[in-house]
Interface confidence: low
């Protein structure tokens, strides 16, 4: 949209000369301009690019006879060079030039630090048409200035492939102090020194630094920004800030706790997750970590048995995952399990100790005296054993496992007979004939299966032999017995 | 995007053995901190924790079924597996797969799939 | 094991209304977590640890407790809150689940 401005016509000389105006720190308003009888000045907006001259519907009248003159060099007129303000106020600054009307499509562009202001700024362009020459105005505006408005504006204006600049407009925009780095929260030994950094920044410098623990001042005397605060040590918690001052006045920084490292609290929840006959697996929720992370922890684990001595055995174990598989342990034992964590303060306590229990064993020796004979008469292999010596551990006896083996002609096949724990005998049928059967023996608790005893060998001959002679378990170290019938 | 998805036989006999797959993506079982847990609700009923495992291989299964349960992970394509053996018609039920959230000092079910339907009937 | 009791098992308020669940254990537990089911879908993760609100649990949603007693309340119900909630435990195996409370908007 295009708005203009009607002014009552006033006699003004010609416009050749320097725009009047000066700028107001804090604020400054639109020159008013100068123009002559019989033109009226015309606000120029572009609705597509903000900062651009609109001239679509403004004449800059042509001068047919221009190669008969001599035309001055075109310039921006001067303006002022340097604008002090506070945050949030408003500013606005022009530039001006006076191009002959020969010219036509000129375009004048704001610029800031070197890149072309393009989008929403607020920069209006205005035309003042004479016979012979037109001064344009270039204002720039700025509402509420904040610190990133800071920097040098220029105007550029293209003119028939030439390109003008202006002098600099430097802004400046002051305020409180504003931090480029704070202290941090840390987490330190007790008694040992350490640093703490604040650095703040104006306009207007310089800033100075006073430095602030749990809430009284450290420092008589203000540091100019940057400040390290070297803290020899503490012995308790603290929280430290940090106070920026510069002539706007004073900014403080975020406080930051530093927190004394100390022992682990002892873990809690200590659970048991599954046992078996020699292993528990345990899990416990840690407790808090002292301001230290936590680098290892310790199961420690306790015979629950009078007969026991006490000793107290121990696994160390990461921090994470909160979980240890506890092994080597005896079948069918009560144990106390406690669990500790450090952290590079040292050891936590121990957590409440807990309760629990290994599952029987498997047994650990076979049964004794393995006999094995023929009963031809009914077909049957006889085996006979005696009961083998289980520790307590092992758990109730609950039955016997026999694996016979029948090989012939280079065929083998294996079979398996459960029996109940008060046998000590049983008798299982001739598979086949002219063939060997080899007997193992393992006793069986809950806890599993028993090592077998070592094998009984017997020919089982064809139909009509007599013999019936019994295999045996060998005596230590004997080979393997083959009877052959 | 965490999503899992469980598939299985919809319908089986008592007696067989149910397999059942967890199929899940937007994060790794290989990964430090991450589990996978299985669930189930008999309709209208309330929900049952079966088993989950954890990211090291750690297995922990509901001790009333424990003969019964086999979970397992291929964590390279993303699934976990769990086998119930010897289905009886109490084993009907939705079943779902979770991913556990591992807290420092907690853990729960963060992210729970659809549920896949079984029914055991003869 | 753990056992874990939700009372009530049903629950009737009117919108606007503030209701409470609890859910007691048999043994002492660190931490209850709450779910939320509606019939059709699966449960949903509501309050972890036993105050923490997932992300998108309305604020009206509150969860507290210790040792043996939680409890979950809703300052004032809307009708989107109808649903059972289950209350679980993981501090010991079996991690069991409570029977759940349905909460019915009258």
């Known amino acids: 949209a295009i708005t203009e401005a009607r002014e009552e016509a006033k006699p003004y000389p010609l416009f050749p000369g320097p725009l009047p105006g000066s700028l107001q720190t804090d604020h400054t308003s639109l020159l008013s301009l100068p123009h002559t009888s019989g033109y009226q000045p015309a606000l120029m907006f572009s609705p597509t690019q903000p900062g651009r001259p609109y001239t679509g519907n403004v004449a800059i009248p042509r001068v047919t006879s221009a190669g008969s003159k001599l035309l001055p060099p075109l310039a921006f007129k001067h303006t002022v060079g340097h604008i002090i303000l506070s945050e949030h106020k408003d500013v606005k600054f022009n530039c001006s030039i006076s191009v002959p009307n020969i010219y036509q499509d000129t375009t004048i562009s704001w610029w800031k630090d070197g890149k072309e202001l393009l989008g929403a700024h607020h920069a209006i362009t205005q035309f003042y048409p004479d016979d012979e020459v037109t001064a344009i105005i270039a204002s720039f505006s700025i509402t509420s200035v904040q610190r990133s408005d800071n920097g040098s504006y220029i105007c550029k204006m293209k003119i028939n492939n030439e390109e003008i600049v202006s002098d600099p407009i430097y802004i400046e925009v002051q305020g409180l102090p504003h931090f480029t780095k704070q202290p941090e929260s840390m987490n330190v030994t007790r008694n040992t020194a350490f640093n703490l950094t604040c650095q703040a920044v104006g306009p207007p410098e310089p800033v100075n630094i006073f430095w602030v623990q749990n809430s009284s001042r450290v420092n008589e005397q203000p540091e100019k920004s940057p400040s390290v605060l070297t803290v020899p040590g503490l012995t308790e918690m603290a929280v430290f800030s940090c106070e920026a001052h510069n002539d706007k006045g004073l900014t403080v920084s975020k406080g930051v706790q530093i927190n004394i490292k100390a022992i682990p609290s002892p873990p809690t929840e200590v659970s048991i997750h599954n046992s078996t006959a020699h292993s528990i697996l345990i899990s416990w929720v840690p407790g808090f970590d002292g301001y230290s992370p936590f680098r290892n922890c310790s199961v420690q684990v306790k015979e629950v048995d009078p007969l026991s001595n006490g000793s107290v055995m121990i696994f160390n174990t990461s921090a994470s995952p909160h979980m240890y598989q506890i092994k080597q342990l005896q079948a069918l034992a009560n144990y106390s399990i406690g669990v500790s964590c450090m952290n590079e303060i040292g050891w936590s306590a121990v957590s409440p100790w807990i309760l629990a229990s290994t599952t029987e064993g498997a047994p650990s020796v076979a049964p004794l005296n393995v006999t094995v004979f023929l009963n031809e008469s009914r077909d049957n292999v006889d085996i006979r054993w005696m009961k083998p010596l289980t520790k307590r551990q092992a758990g109730e006896l609950v039955g016997y496992r026999i694996s016979h083996v029948w090989q012939s002609a280079g065929i083998s096949k294996e079979l398996l007979e459960e029996v109940g724990q008060n046998n000590s005998r049983a008798q299982i049928s001739v598979q086949v004939h002219n063939a060997t059967c080899t007997v193992r023996i393992a006793a069986v608790t809950k806890g599993g299966v028993g090592p077998f005893s070592d094998p009984v060998k017997i020919f089982i001959p064809a139909h009509g032999w007599v013999d019936h002679a019994p295999s045996s378990t060998p005596a230590p170290g004997n080979a393997d017995p083959v009877l052959i019938i | 995007q965490v999503t899992l998805k469980e598939s299985g036989p919809g319908i089986l006999q008592p007696s067989q053995t149910l397999s059942l797959t967890c199929s899940f993506s937007?994060?790794?079982?290989?990964?430090?901190?991450?589990?996978v847990g299985w669930i189930r609700q008999p309709s209208g009923k309330g929900l049952e924790w079966l088993a989950h495992?954890?990211?090291?291989?750690?297995?922990y299964y509901e001790p009333a079924l424990k003969s019964r349960l086999t979970i397992s992970k291929d964590s390279s394509k993303n699934q976990v597996f769990l086998k119930i053996a010897n289905v009886d018609t109490a084993d009907t039920a939705t079943y779902y797969c979770?991913?556990?959230?591992?807290?420092?000092?907690?853990?729960?079910?963060?992210?729970w799939g659809t549920g896949t339907t079984v029914t055991v009937s003869s | 094991q753990i056992v874990l009791s939700q009372s009530p098992a049903i629950l009737s308020a009117f919108p606007g209304e503030k209701v409470t669940m609890t859910c007691r254990a048999t043994?002492?537990?660190?931490?209850m977590h709450w779910y939320q089911q509606k019939p059709g879908s699966s449960p949903k993760p509501w309050i972890y640890?036993?105050?923490n609100l997932t992300s998108g649990v309305p604020a009206r949603f509150s969860g507290s407790g210790s040792g043996t007693s939680y409890s979950l309340t809703i300052s004032r119900v809307e009708a989107e809150d109808a649903a059972t909630y289950y209350c679980?435990?993981?501090?010991?195996?079996?991690?069991?689940f409570g029977g759940g409370t349905k909460l019915e908007i009258k």
């Open positions: 495992i954890w990211w090291y291989d750690d297995k």
């Open positions: 679980h435990q993981w501090s010991s195996n079996p991690y069991t």
């Open positions: 640890a036993t105050y």
């Open positions: 937007g994060f790794s079982l290989s990964t430090f901190g991450m589990g």
């Open positions: 043994s002492s537990v660190r931490y």
């Open positions: 979770a991913r556990i959230y591992y807290g420092t000092s907690y853990r729960y079910f963060d992210v």
